[in-house]
Each structure stands twice: as structure tokens, then as C-alpha cells.
Interface confidence: low
């Protein structure tokens, strides 16, 4: 009777993790007696699956009823795979000895390759916002894939992205692998309402591509445009001049207005008009009440937006043609800022 | 480069069979399911179904099961359609396209074509 | 099975014109929606994925939007090559579907 032969007849089995692995193993002959154990890996480091005779091994469950005694199939399920069961295993078959069963046979082992999906790729971008025409970083990353095959692309709205380096880790075999790129992207002043978006491409992935996404404006800041102009007069003493404050993103401005380098009233942006390319509008008025100056006066228009430097706008009121109200001490009126325009 | 290049035209008698090849090159072949579509004279494209190159397992949209047969040889990086009993309304432009995902997306969206086969089923 | 419609069936334009076709499903398709250009005797090409995405090599003045049911493929400034017909089709569900086609000729 020809020897025992114990078959594995895959060479490689692959599984998606959580799903569950079939090993196939079968024996050729009943002889000799004596049991049937797995093991990952080979030598004397082999960790052991499962064994026949005796031991709990919860995750593992046999194809064939192994009580039989015409059993030759020793084929065997294991559950819920994660990466860190990828290897090589091989079934052995013991010969009954005493006190120990001794090595008889092995497979020619299977390699269980694990699919494990990326995470969601996540997009960050820099801690402070930039003007447009800089240069800004932006880094994906995904994690716990496995292969290592991976695919990851860059995209600012619907155009591809070309300035970018991408890093798989690590390097060497692993049970799972990350993935972390980082892409340049030039701002520009219509990027308030632009997306950058990080697209990973897998085989594990069953539908498109995993995208992350990062708002530009979380990033960009668009300063604004200031104009200062003097309107028709509305009482005989009274001059309404107005600040145009144009196109600026994020909303967060102070407005001060200085007559002569005094200062004679600050407001905070409210109620602004939101522009197509998502900047802001606002527009601050001064009743200027020209009896209480005897000389021209020098208005300015000073705007802080988001914590910069001011930048101010000046406007030189001509008084000499106005007749002197003795006596009034009023240089300008708080009253009705912040009308609303849409421009 | 990512090429498809597909079989030359045929000329069929109704009741034949025909097998329209589809090469490709420039990628590993089982990394990207393959689809096939139809073309009839002057009319839209209508997808017929595709093939898990990775599995060899195929999909048909419901008006091509039975007489239409993807198969696959991974050897020679190239997808076939096998059509039997042909009809005359078989007559058709049929392509391979490949989709963007890899070999286990589903379908999806077609990102290379091949040149296309004109089948002709006449008398 | 999802249908889907484009309008119009034809669409008459001049070089340099901006041109706009629509394409709605009968259901939800998420951003699960391409666009493909077909020139008479030729392949299809791919123009647009994801709703939005352009692939490489497709010039920027074309551009598509939308999402759920409704999607425009639009073309900023329409150059002599650009007379074809252009199909969108949806990969949310089985079967894949395409619409008939735009017809985009010289007016």
C-alpha cells in the first residue's frame, strides 16, 4: 500500500479580513493512526492552529467530522481573519506513539493572504491660513490596508493634482501598511468655496475609491479691498462718507474710523453680503457733522480682518466751503452702520 | 501605455457563433474587471455585463444571459465574448472597457476602450 | 433599472460657445455618474468620473456637477473637436445604464 501522502491543494488562499479562511487539507490512507495538527509558519517557532487530539482553538472549526473513523479530511475554518493571520500553514499528520505522538507528514502548506480595507482617508491642512498666490501643504493619510498595493491620487475641485509625495509604511513585509502624501496646492482668491480632496484606490475596495476631503476655506484667508468715499450731503452740516469693505474671507473684521488720527468709532462686521465666489462684502458709514471742524478733515477707514495687521484707507473732507456752527462739540453721529448691500 | 486592442470585424450567418477578443497591455490584466458593451446601428450604448478578471467569475445584465459567454486567459492578458445562436439583432459594435476600480469593484466607470468589433449577423 | 435622460437629443452650437448638457436618473445615484464623448466610427472616450472627476488629458473646459439625480456635463468654450455625441452613464446600481446621447453639432 502506497505511503501516506498528506495533500494541501492550495498553494495560496486569499480572504478579506473579518471573513473566514478554508484551509483544505486531506490525507491519502488511514495509516498510520495518529492525529492531525496545524500550524502557521515552520520550524521550531511554528505557532500552533489547531489540534485534533486535544486544546480549545475557538476560532477554528473542522469541515469534516474528524470523529469519523473513515475521515480523511482534515480541512479546517478559521473565523473572523484579521491581517495578523497572513502566513504560511501547513497540516501535519502525527503518527500514534508513546508517550508522544511523533511528526509523520506535512503539506506542502497554504499561504492565507489577508485583504484588510483602508481607513478613510483623512485630509488635514495647515494650522494657519494663507493668502492667495502661497503655497500650501496639505497630507492624507489612510491606514491598515493590506496588500500594500495601494493607489492614492490628489484632486483640487475636479482637476488632478500633480505636486504631491506619497509614502507606503513600511517598507518591508507587514501585516498591514499606511499610507501618508503630502500635496501642494496655489491658492488663489476664488478658493473660498474650492475643496482638495485625497482619492485611495484599493483592491479591497468593492465601490469607488475612498475620498477625503479638506475645505479650503478652513485655510485660506483673502484680504480685503478698501474705498473710502464721500456721499452727496444729507443735512447742511452733515457729510455721509462710506467704506466699502470688498471681497474678504473669513467674515472676522473690525472696522475703526479715525477723524484726524482720533479715533471715533469701532464696529465689528455683521450683517455682510456674501459674494459668488463665497468672500464677503461690508460697507461702514460716518455721519461726519462738519460745523464742529474748523479746518478739512482727514477720515480714515482702518480694518482689521482676521487678526492681521490693519490696513486703512484715508479720505480728506473739505469743510472751507460749509458755514461754522459755534459751539457744537459733535463730530460724528454712531448712528446706522453696517446698511446692507449687495454688489 | 494602457491599451485594449480588440479582434477585427466579423460576418456571421444567423444560428453561428462568433468570439470577439480583447487584449490588453500596459497594466496586469486581473487588476481591473472588464466590461463588455453594446452598440447597435445608430443607437446608445447598452452594457452587457463584465468579468471578474481576478476570479474569472462573470456578471450579465439581464439581456445577455445564455447565449453570451465572457471568459478570460490570464496568460495572454485577454478577455473574450463568445456569442452563440447568433441573431440578426445581435448585429452590433461590441467593446471592452475597463474600469477605474480594481478587479474586485463591480462595474463602474469606464476609464480605457477598446477600438471596438463589428459583428454582422446576416444571410 | 435606472433610466436615464439627457437634453437635448441634439444641441446645435457654434466654436467658442459655452455649452451645457443635462442628464437626470430616474433615481438616486449618489456622485456614481461618467461621461464618455463618441465620435462617429470610433470608441467611446472617458471624459469625466464621479460626477466631477476629469481624467487625465481631458482638457479643463470640460467640467461636469451634480449629484443625486441631476447632472450637467459643460463645456466653457467649444473647440472644432469637440462635435460628437456625449453619453453619461450611472455605476450606482445594477444594470449599469447609459442615456441615449447628446448630439453636439455645428450650428
Known amino acids: 500500500e502506497e505511503e501516506l501522502q498528506v495533500i494541501q491543494p492550495d498553494k495560496s488562499v486569499l480572504v478579506a479580513a473579518g471573513e473566514t479562511a478554508t484551509l483544505r487539507c486531506t490525507a491519502t490512507s488511514l495509516i498510520p493512526v495518529g492525529p492531525i495538527q496545524w500550524f502557521r509558519g515552520a520550524g521550531p517557532g511554528r505557532e500552533l492552529i489547531y489540534n485534533q487530539k486535544e486544546g480549545h482553538f475557538p476560532r477554528v472549526t473542522t469541515v469534516s467530522d474528524l470523529t469519523k473513523r473513515n475521515n480523511m479530511d482534515f480541512s479546517i475554518r478559521i473565523g473572523n481573519i484579521t491581517p495578523a493571520d497572513a502566513g504560511t500553514y501547513y497540516c501535519v499528520k502525527f503518527r500514534k506513539g508513546s508517550p508522544d505522538d511523533v511528526e509523520f507528514k506535512s503539506g506542502a502548506g497554504t499561504e492565507l493572504s489577508v485583504r484588510a480595507k483602508p481607513s478613510a482617508p483623512v485630509v488635514s491642512g495647515p494650522a494657519a491660513r494663507a493668502t492667495p498666490q502661497h503655497t500650501v501643504s496639505f497630507t492624507c493619510e489612510s491606514h491598515g490596508f493590506s496588500p500594500r498595493d495601494i493607489t492614492l491620487k490628489w484632486f483640487k475641485n475636479g482637476n488632478e493634482l500633480s505636486d504631491f509625495q506619497t509614502n507606503v509604511d513600511p517598507v518591508g513585509e507587514s501585516v498591514s501598511y499606511s499610507i501618508h502624501s503630502t500635496a501642494k496646492v496655489v491658492l488663489t482668491r476664488e478658493d473660498v468655496h474650492s475643496q482638495v480632496i485625497c482619492e485611495v484606490a484599493h483592491v479591497t475596495l468593492q465601490g469607488d475609491p475612498l475620498r477625503g476631503t479638506a475645505n479650503l476655506s478652513e485655510t485660506i484667508r483673502v484680504p480685503p479691498t478698501l474705498e473710502v468715499t464721500q456721499q452727496p450731503v444729507r443735512a447742511e452740516n452733515q457729510v455721509n462718507v462710506t467704506c466699502q469693505v470688498r471681497k474678504f474671507y473669513p467674515q472676522r473684521l473690525q472696522l475703526t474710523w479715525l477723524e484726524n488720527g482720533n479715533v471715533s468709532r469701532t464696529e465689528t462686521a455683521s450683517t455682510v453680503t456674501e459674494n459668488k465666489d463665497g468672500t464677503y462684502n461690508w460697507m461702514s458709514w460716518l455721519l461726519v457733522n462738519v460745523s464742529a471742524h474748523r479746518d478739512d478733515v482727514k477720515l480714515t477707514c482702518q480694518v482689521e480682518h482676521d487678526g492681521q495687521p490693519a490696513v486703512s484707507k484715508s479720505h480728506d473732507l473739505k469743510v472751507s466751503a460749509h458755514p461754522k456752527e459755534q459751539g457744537s462739540n459733535t463730530a460724528a453721529e454712531n448712528t446706522g452702520s453696517n446698511e446692507r448691500n449687495i454688489y | 501605455q494602457i491599451q485594449l486592442v480588440q479582434s477585427g470585424s466579423e460576418l456571421k450567418k444567423p444560428g453561428a457563433s462568433v468570439k470577439v477578443s480583447c487584449k490588453a497591455s500596459?497594466?496586469?490584466?486581473?487588476?481591473?474587471?472588464m466590461n463588455w458593451v453594446r452598440q447597435a446601428p445608430g443607437q446608445g450604448l447598452e452594457w452587457m455585463g463584465f468579468?471578474?478578471?481576478?476570479?474569472?467569475?462573470?456578471t450579465y445584465a439581464q439581456g445577455f444571459k445564455g447565449r453570451f459567454v465572457f471568459s478570460l486567459d490570464t496568460s495572454v492578458s485577454t478577455a473574450y465574448l463568445q456569442i452563440s445562436s447568433l441573431k440578426a439583432e445581435d448585429t452590433a459594435v461590441y467593446y471592452c472597457?475597463?474600469?477605474?476600480?480594481?478587479?474586485?469593484?463591480?462595474?463602474?466607470?469606464?476609464?480605457?476602450w477598446g477600438q471596438g468589433t463589428l459583428v454582422t449577423v446576416s444571410s | 433599472d435606472i433610466q436615464m435622460t439627457q437634453s437635448p437629443s441634439r444641441l446645435g452650437a457654434s466654436v467658442g460657445d459655452r455649452v451645457t448638457i443635462t442628464c437626470r436618473a430616474s433615481?438616486?445615484?449618489?456622485?456614481?455618474l461618467a461621461w464618455y464623448q463618441q465620435k462617429p466610427g470610433k470608441a467611446p472616450k472617458s471624459l469625466i468620473y464621479?460626477?466631477?472627476y476629469r481624467y487625465i488629458g481631458v482638457p479643463s473646459r470640460f467640467s461636469g456637477s451634480g449629484s443625486g439625480t441631476d447632472f450637467t456635463l459643460t463645456i466653457s468654450s467649444l473647440q472644432p473637436e469637440d462635435f460628437a455625441t456625449y453619453f453619461c452613464?450611472?455605476?450606482?446600481?445594477?444594470?449599469?445604464t447609459f442615456d441615449q446621447g447628446t448630439k453636439l453639432e455645428i450650428k
Open positions: 500596459g497594466y496586469s490584466i486581473t487588476n481591473y474587471a
Open positions: 464621479s460626477a466631477i
Open positions: 472597457a475597463r474600469t477605474r476600480g480594481y478587479y474586485d469593484f463591480d462595474g463602474g466607470a469606464f476609464d480605457y
Open positions: 452613464q450611472q455605476y450606482n446600481t445594477y444594470p449599469l
Open positions: 433615481q438616486n445615484v449618489g456622485t456614481h
Open positions: 468579468i471578474n478578471t481576478y476570479t474569472g467569475e462573470p
